[in-house]
């Protein structure tokens, strides 16, 4: 094995090209200069290396950059990124959104891997906050990204970033997360007129307090039942029958189908039967 450590005559790689796929593992190790590999990283993704060969190439980069790869290399990793461990990625300092996008593209269409989660964490921590461009990028690749953050992490999201959030990005958020996001959304959308405001704020209403729901009930918003069912129970309970009727508009008839489910069930039990009867839905308090 010892004699195999020297590169055979005439096999020294002058560039990263397809001839390297015929090299054995030990030949790649001995004949490919790590610095050459680093400068021609973008070529690797167009060459059908085996998984074993990729392990060798990664090992060479690890030896060249024991403290972590520079961003110029990271940006061109392509599918070699999928060979990185979270421990490798923690050594990186990724500051460019273009680099982040390039690496997210490699994993596109698949669940967030530990590598991607670590990469995002490093990137966001490096920026200090989750700015609009970053949030735009992350939710484009991972619609559920926002809801994967803790309430503490969400507190660092500036209100201006809320404009990037789409309704589907909030599908898996729990009430604690919406409690943090709602005030930010309210602030972000405060200068919009009534109907436009409601369209934007609707997805965040699971964090709205009673007084805001009362205010919305005065604006003919016609909230659908799906949104109503996601409201905080403690925010719905103090609402009067008249307020709920105004809030839901023509959708009020949907209360009957949801009468056994929270928050409708708990709200019904808090109302006077005479008031419920005015709805003509046969709701029993």
């Amino acid at each position: 094995e010892v004699e195999k450590t020297a590169c055979p005559s005439g096999k020294k790689a002058r560039e990263i090209d397809e001839s390297l796929i015929f090299y054995k593992k030990w030949e790649l190790e001995a004949c490919v200069d790590a610095a050459l590999l680093a400068t021609q990283m973008d070529r690797v993704n167009a060459i059908p290396f085996t998984y074993e060969q990729l392990d060798v190439l990664k090992h060479k980069l690890d030896e060249l950059y024991p403290q972590g790869y520079p961003e110029s290399v990271i940006q061109h990793l392509g599918y070699l990124f999928l060979k990185m461990s979270p421990e490798d990625i923690r050594k990186w300092n990724v500051t460019s959104l273009e680099t982040l996008k390039a690496l997210l593209e490699v994993n596109k269409g698949h669940e967030m891997s530990p590598q991607v989660a670590t990469l995002i964490d490093r990137f966001v921590k490096g920026r200090g906050q989750l700015d609009k461009d970053t949030l735009d990028t992350l939710t484009a690749f991972y619609p559920g990204y926002l809801c994967s953050l803790s309430p503490e992490e969400l507190s660092s999201v500036p209100p201006s970033s809320i404009w990037a959030v789409r309704p589907q990005d909030l599908d898996t958020c729990d009430p604690r997360q919406l409690d943090v996001l709602y005030p930010k959304a309210r602030l972000a959308f405060q200068n919009m007129n009534g109907s436009e405001y409601f369209v934007k704020i609707q997805s965040f209403l699971g964090g709205a307090p009673t007084e805001d729901l009362k205010a919305l009930s005065q604006q003919n918003v016609s909230m659908d039942l799906a949104t109503f069912m996601k409201l905080r129970t403690d925010a719905v309970l103090p609402l009067t029958v008249a307020e709920v009727q105004k809030l839901l508009g023509p959708h009020v008839e949907g209360l009957k189908a949801e009468e056994r489910h929270r928050p409708v069930r708990d709200w019904i039990l808090r109302q006077r039967q005479d008031d419920l009867d005015t709805l003509g839905l046969g709701l029993q308090g």
Epitope: F49, Y51, N107
Partner: antibody, heavy 119, light 107 residues
């Protein structure tokens, strides 16, 4: 020579689970990725999942995400497919197949094992 | 996800014919395309990889061409053993997608 032998197929009720195995020989199993591909009766081929050589990278077709889990035991030269919450549309012959790199085709295939999901 | 569309779905031909099967990708896949042959009750067999490279042991009457989104498999002198179903497949770092198949049957 390369040999891949699937096992574990059979008849199972909807909602139940099944685990398929694929025993590999004739090559360095720990060096290559392994795939599962299925073929419903009278239909075409559908790629199901892949697991890279070291076992940490796993990718799935949308149709099985969250229900199927691919895994491997390199010490036993064996590939697995854990299939949960089975549906009638999962009825198919399941093949295991090898690929040698991210930009390599499926060069060796097993003979397949039939999974029938029926009540 | 990348979709692969094969045409025709069925092809009737005679021994000695030259047949061509087309495969179209929904987005560019460079040259990362393979062709497989499958006979009833058997596993698929790799014929062509990287769009035009012939797998070891495959007769030279099989050839492939194309890049980007348009690919073709040609059988130059159809033999009795060639009547089967043929599939194209794109492959990249983590997913593979097959075309729906083309059945080559005896005319």
């Amino acid at each position: 020579q390369v040999q891949l032998v699937e096992s574990g197929g059979g008849v199972v009720q909807p909602g139940r689970s099944l685990r398929l195995s694929c025993a590999a020989s004739g090559f360095t199993f720990s060096s290559d990725a392994m795939n599962w591909v299925r073929q419903a009766p009278g239909k075409g081929l559908e790629w199901v999942a892949v697991i890279w050589n070291e076992g940490s990278n796993k990718y799935y077709a949308d149709s099985v995400k969250g229900r199927f889990t691919i895994s491997r035991d390199n010490s036993k030269n064996t590939l697995y497919l854990q299939m949960n919450s089975l549906r009638a549309e999962d009825t198919a012959v399941y093949y295991c197949a090898r690929d040698r790199g991210p930009l390599w085709p499926l060069d060796y295939w097993g003979q397949g094992t039939l999974v029938t999901v029926s009540s | 996800d990348i979709q692969m569309t094969q045409s025709p779905s069925t092809l009737s031909a005679s021994v000695g014919d030259r047949v061509t099967i087309t495969c179209r990708a929904s987005q560019s896949i460079s040259r990362w395309l393979a062709w497989y042959q499958q006979k009833p009750g058997k596993a698929p067999k790799l014929l062509i990889y990287k769009a035009s490279s012939l797998e070891s042991g495959v007769p030279s009457r099989f050839s492939g061409s194309g890049s980007g989104t348009e690919f073709t498999l040609t059988i130059s002198n159809l033999q009795p053993d060639d009547f089967a179903t043929f599939y194209c497949q794109q492959y990249n770092a983590y997913s593979r997608t097959f075309g729906q198949g083309t059945k080559v049957e005896i005319k």
